[in-house]
């Protein structure tokens, strides 16, 4: 009996959690269509659980195609970030809440907040502006939402969803997630992949600053830009260390910093838990 059940249960190579799709078309394979235009579009990759770039030919294709990364995420990733819903009222806090305050090595004096595990409260500290750790929040409210126990036994999860103690229902809360750090790597890592003007099809890698990963692309053999590496390792060495974004669970994720006004939105939309 148990052997048969084993056969019927799918566990993918990467041990992904259940996929709660907002729309089934988000699962479609990226389809460039039969036309020959070169248009940058985004699709949701069901295996990586992320919105990724692809080149669309300009006609036909399918619904898993979006003009912008934000649109893709809005349509396809709302429930796919493997968020850890607190199913018990005293669930563990994220690990980073227990880290010591760390001003980092830079010399800015920015007011930030950290969770003090001794006093069990969020407190103010001076942040230098770079490095440090994830126990570092722009606002007191943000720190409290992530690391402190809420009132009346409520526990707020890292995606601003509150578990109601009475009936276990989920209530969206207008909470921020931790904000982004700076980019300290070469500026060309921020540039998009550029095929160049010639007609070759060489396998190269570029750093995709939106998703924080080195991705393959086809280089034409001439022109282009410096975000062009012959190996994935070379790409990672040059670009990956430069991007640091704190996320609310599961360690660091790499991304590009946007203007301050956009930060909260982007931090929210670009969270993917590391163990996915």
């Amino acid at each position: 009996d148990s052997e048969e059940d084993e056969e019927h249960t799918i566990i993918t190579d990467t041990e992904l959690p259940p996929l709660k799709l907002m729309h089934s078309f988000c699962a479609f394979k990226a389809d460039d269509g039969p036309c020959k235009a070169i248009m940058k579009r985004f699709f949701f990759n069901i295996f990586t659980r992320q919105c990724e770039e692809f080149i669309y030919g300009g006609c036909e294709g399918n619904q898993n195609r979006f003009e912008s990364l934000e649109e893709c995420k809005k349509m396809c990733t709302r429930d796919n970030a493997n968020r850890i819903i607190k199913t018990t009222l005293q669930q563990e806090k994220p690990d980073f809440c227990f880290l010591e305050e760390d001003p980092g090595i830079c010399r800015g004096y920015i007011t930030r907040y950290f969770y003090n595990n001794q006093t069990k409260q969020c407190e103010r500290f001076k942040y230098g502006g770079c490095l440090g750790n994830m126990n570092n929040f722009e606002t007191l409210e943000e720190c409290k939402n992530i690391c402190e126990d809420g009132p009346n036994g409520f526990q707020v999860d890292n995606y601003g969803t509150q578990l109601n103690a009475v009936n276990n229902s989920l209530t969206p809360q207008s909470t921020k997630v931790p904000s982004l750090f700076e980019f300290h790597g070469p500026s060309w890592c921020l540039t998009p992949a550029d095929r160049g003007l010639c007609r070759a099809n060489e396998n190269r890698f570029y750093y995709n600053s939106v998703i924080g990963k080195c991705r393959p692309f086809k280089y034409s053999g001439c022109g282009g830009n410096e975000n062009n590496f012959t190996s994935k390792q070379e790409c990672l060495r040059a670009c990956k260390k430069g991007f640091i974004q704190r996320i609310s669970k599961g360690g660091l994720i790499k991304t590009k910093r946007k203007r301050k006004k956009q930060r909260v939105k982007i931090a929210y939309e670009e969270i993917f838990v590391k163990n996915m």
Epitope: H8, T9, I10, P18, L19, K20, L21, M22, H23, S24, F25, C26, A27, F28, K29, D31, D32, P34, I46, F47, N62, Q63, D79
Partner: antibody, heavy 118, light 107 residues
């Protein structure tokens, strides 16, 4: 253990109705889309209907559109198929399946036989 | 809407490689899955997402998909692999589509 168990099949006259149920256990039911797939005696698999997880949007094969209704009760971990205006060609074993997107069915029930005959 | 065409039957000697094809217009632009069904039993997913294998499925099962044709390959076929095999894909109107099925006979 992940399991799907169908029930509600049986003999029904043409033009009659039947409601199939599929009880799910061993996984978070409301995280998944669910499908019904049927197999006429000695024939191949035919997809019947799909219901999405988050939106509960429904989709149907042309052969059953307007006659069959798929629904789910997440509080009971149960999938349903209401079949009206049944025809002889609806005779089949009906399987419920856990569906990833619309792409593949990774867990299947053992099936329930529906016979439409006078 | 897409139609998936499979050969009605394929025969293979034990230990040899069996290949079952599934063809459909621009099938390579969609994911294809494969199911194994033995008499009196429910189907079992053996390949999903063109070439991925669920846990519990032997390594001898593999898949590929490009152009208009997807292929299920069973290398070192064993007697227990004798079964009906169905390919399955989808339409952009969110319908699943199954091929007609292929009966694999292990000689």
């Amino acid at each position: 253990q992940v399991q799907l168990v169908e029930s509600g099949g049986g003999l029904v006259q043409p033009g009659g109705s039947l409601r199939l149920s599929c009880a799910a256990s061993g996984f978070t039911f409301n995280d998944y889309a669910m499908s019904w797939v049927r197999q006429a005696p000695g024939k191949g698999l035919e997809w019947v209907s799909l219901i999405e997880s988050v939106s509960s949007s429904t989709y149907y094969a042309d052969s059953v559109k307007g006659r069959f209704t798929i629904s789910r009760d997440n509080s009971k971990n149960t999938l349903y198929l209401q079949m009206n205006s049944l025809r002889a060609e609806d005779t089949a074993v009906y399987y419920c399946a856990r569906t990833i997107g619309v792409l593949w069915d990774d867990v299947w029930g053992q099936g329930t036989l529906v016979t439409v005959s006078s | 809407d897409i139609e998936l065409t499979q050969p009605p039957s394929v025969s293979v000697a034990p230990g040899q490689t069996a290949r079952i094809s599934c063809s459909g217009d621009a099938l390579g632009s969609k994911y294809v899955s494969w199911y194994q069904q033995k008499p009196g039993q429910a189907p079992v997913l053996v390949i999903y997402g063109d070439n991925k294998r669920p846990s519990g499925i032997p390594e001898r099962f593999s898949g590929s998909n490009s152009g208009n044709t997807a292929t299920l390959t069973i290398s070192g076929t064993q007697a227990e692999d004798e079964a009906d095999y169905y390919c399955q894909s989808y339409t952009y109107s969110l319908n699943q589509v199954f091929g007609g099925g292929t009966k694999l006979t292990v000689l």
